[in-house]
Interface confidence: low
């Protein structure tokens, strides 16, 4: 396999690419539908309730058949609508031009309206972060879109649960979609503008907070839900913003909006590097550090209630999910990979091909165990035991499962319980679990996880020879569950 | 009632040191940043200084900074101001005021009664 | 060091709406200058009214309240009424310091 496999996927290259696949492909599976829990207002008297997504639990059988239905009855119904099906979310660059990106270019914001709707989608992009001036002036160098709006293109396509195709994101086609592009290199937590002294702005929470504003007069205001999501450093943002975002429509009068957050591959751990570096630059820097930084650089600010229980100059604490998501009033969706290659990343972890050594290959296992740990008590999380990073705008986001259960399925499922007839209820909706933590304890060990490809010959390959290829030894991940490795190499190869 | 009291001001040569204090009460004080501002004879408003609840960060203007201290002793309640090399252009009226946090928008909402401080020779 | 500059004095008379403004000598004032209006009364009585551009300290009557106009930040009195008659400072944050504006008389006939 030529100089070994990287499965590896930097973020910043992830993004600097603008492609949300990277080097991963996706199998299509039978498609399954969506899902969710933890309790919010019903909607004020005499209002109209919105039905919610179609409930597949009756479809068993041929979902491609039936998702050709919806979509076909979507398009007939659709034609009074001057938007046609079009994908496209349009850009609109913010009216108050003092919320800026890093360079002092406006920020702004992608909209696809759908006026049926009363559900709102804001996603957060993500995109690591830069938190000294050496490291942003580098970042500005090589990834100029992360920190300026001045060549973003005018249309963005919307993608996974950003899709308006019904077969792609049987979760909520149909809600207004929004993709809000990350500009300000903080997290989403920065309070700083461009100043002489500052050669750069820092404002990822007020972006946020004046897309919100700006989206009140296009249509925002009659919302029934809005969903705050983000992948990455977007993730982590949702984290840190959905309360305020909360508290900040109750303030401007809009106290019926239920506000929801939507983590994916945001909640990270302030582990113990597999080898420590010195804080260099952003990926070798330990994430408490990088953080501790950053907070200074940007003048970062965190959700109040947890900065209320840590002491001063400690506030990085609530980056890091499993810290912050107590404090919320907000129902939190979390979606993480347990092997997931940014905190592998920061955690100097790099897979290149070459055999695992036993310790290496301890840590790995031991870091997915800690994260599954840090996930018993979010009532409402998907976590897949793959080595992968971010999914929720991928298109084929819908194919990875966790227990038989999709992700969409499972985003319906917490739709469901947090529907007002649910909303005393504490017990989860028969058949519709919210609480999805795959238990299996190595990298790949669910064969719905996306396929990696070698990152030289271009090659898919199976989790049997990613695992080899790894360094795993089969015997000792056989042994665990009580297999032969033949037989276990067996059932990976049919995917079973 | 929250309330806050200066005391040790007064008449001072150029050069020569002071040091003030402003007793914090009915607010939880260790929970809140807090500021030095004052009012000079031509009835201008100047900030001094500003430091963070728990006592890590300080602020100075430059007009200030390397001769005042600003400090804090959270036990008692208390800010102070350690003003040295004062000089005749440090004359004003000085005021601490309460300050929240970055969700209150750093608001001055409380200040004292203010306390004298003349330079002369 | 930035300027920061308002009216010198205005006039109002009760009842009426007034806007009292904030420039700074860097450019457009945005909301992370976290914008602080603080009105001093008779006697070096000195509250703080409003901080971060909008937000209203508790017990500061409801017809005080904090934006931003243009490049500018702004408080307004709607529906001033005769005890509003006071100084009113405003103070800008650049990151590591305030600035504090020269303050403007506002007078309510």
């Known amino acids: 396999m030529g100089r070994g496999v990287r499965v590896l996927l930097l973020l910043s290259l992830l993004h600097c690419a603008g492609g949300s696949e990277g080097r991963k492909t996706w199998r299509r599976r039978g498609q399954q539908p969506p899902p969710p829990p933890r309790t919010e207002a019903a909607p004020a008297a005499g209002q109209p309730v919105e039905s919610f997504p179609l409930d597949f639990t009756a479809v068993e059988g041929n979902m491609d058949s039936f998702m050709a239905q919806v979509k076909s009855l979507a398009q007939s119904l659709y034609p009074c609508s001057a938007q046609q099906l079009n994908e496209d979310l349009r850009l609109h660059l913010l009216l108050n031009t003092s919320v800026t990106c890093n360079d002092g270019s406006p920020a702004g914001y992608y909209l696809k309206e759908s006026r049926g709707s009363r559900r709102w989608l804001l996603f957060l992009e993500g995109g690591w972060y830069c938190f000294n001036r050496e490291n942003c002036d580098s970042r500005y160098d090589t990834m100029r879109r992360l920190m300026s709006s001045r060549d973003w293109p005018r249309t963005r396509t919307g993608t996974g649960i950003l899709s308006s195709q019904p077969e792609e994101n049987p979760y909520w086609w149909n809600a207004n979609m929004v993709f809000i592009p990350y500009c300000s290199s903080d997290v989403w937590s920065g309070a700083s503008s461009k100043s002489e002294k500052n050669e750069y702005a820092f404002m990822g929470a007020l972006i946020i907070q004046e897309v919100v504003r700006e989206l009140l007069g296009r249509g925002l205001s009659g919302a029934k839900v809005l969903l705050l999501a983000g992948s990455s450093a977007g993730g982590t943002g949702v984290l840190l913003n959905v309360d305020r975002v909360a508290e900040q429509l109750e303030k401007l009068g809009y106290p019926a909006i239920q506000v929801r957050g939507l983590a994916d591959s945001g909640w990270f751990l302030d582990n113990k590097q597999y080898r420590h570096t010195d804080c260099v630059d952003t990926i070798t820097c330990a994430p408490t550090e990088a953080i501790r930084r950053g907070i200074r650089y940007w003048n970062g600010v965190v959700p109040e209630r947890c900065r209320r229980q840590f002491q001063e100059g400690e506030e990085w604490n609530c980056f890091f999910g499993y810290k912050v998501y107590p404090t919320l009033r907000c129902p939190v969706f979390v979606v993480q990979w347990l092997f997931d290659e940014a905190q592998l990343t920061v955690d100097n972890v790099h897979l290149t091909g070459q055999p695992v050594q036993e310790g290496l290959r301890l840590y790995i296992q031991n870091l997915g165990r800690e994260l599954r740990h840090t996930l018993k008590d979010v009532p409402a999380s998907f976590a897949p035991a793959c080595l992968s990073h971010e999914i929720i705008i991928r298109s084929h986001w819908t194919d990875v499962q966790v227990k038989g259960t999709s992700l969409p399925r499972a985003l319906h499922c917490w739709d469901r319980s947090l529907h007002d007839s649910h909303k005393a209820s504490k017990t989860p909706l028969k058949g519709c679990p919210v609480h999805l933590v795959d238990s299996c304890p190595w990298p790949h060990c669910n064969p719905s996880c996306p396929t990696v490809r070698d990152q030289f010959t271009g090659q898919e390959m199976n989790v049997a020879q990613f695992l080899m290829h790894m360094g795993f030894d089969m015997q000792t991940v056989a042994q665990p569950q009580g297999l032969e490795p033949s037989e276990l190499l067996g059932m990976l190869s049919n995917g079973s | 009632e929250v309330k806050l009291v200066e005391s040790g001001g007064g008449l001072v040569k150029p050069g020569g040191s002071l040091k003030l204090s402003c007793a914090a009460s009915?607010?939880?004080?260790?929970?809140?940043?807090m500021s030095w501002v004052r009012q000079t004879p031509e009835k201008r408003l100047e900030w001094v200084a500003t430091i963070s609840s728990g006592g890590s960060y300080n602020y100075y203007s430059d007009s200030v900074k390397g001769r005042f201290t600003i400090s804090r002793n959270n036990a008692r309640n208390t800010l102070y101001l350690q003003m040295s090399s004062l000089r005749s252009e440090d004359t004003a009226l000085y005021y601490c005021?309460?300050?929240?946090?970055?969700?209150?928008?750093?608001?001055?909402?409380?200040w004292g009664q203010g306390t004298s401080v003349t330079v002369s020779s | 060091q930035a300027v920061v500059t308002q009216e010198s004095a205005l006039t109002t008379s009760p009842g009426e709406t007034v806007t009292l403004t904030c420039r700074s000598s860097?450019?457009?004032?945005?909301?992370?200058?976290?914008a602080n209006w603080v009105q001093e009364k008779p006697d070096h009585l000195f509250t703080g009214l409003i901080g971060g551009t909008n937000y209203r300290a508790p017990g500061v009557p409801a017809r005080f309240s904090g934006s931003l106009i243009g490049d500018k930040a702004a408080l307004t009195i709607t529906g001033a009424q005769t005890e509003d008659e006071a100084i009113y400072f405003c103070?800008?944050?650049?990151?590591?310091?305030?600035?504090f504006g020269g303050g403007t008389k506002l007078t309510v006939l």
């Open positions: 009915g607010f939880v004080f260790s929970s809140h940043d």
């Open positions: 860097t450019g457009a004032v945005t909301t992370s200058y976290y």
């Open positions: 103070a800008l944050w650049y990151n590591n310091h305030w600035v």
């Open positions: 005021a309460r300050q929240g946090d970055r969700y209150d928008g750093y608001v001055m909402d409380y």
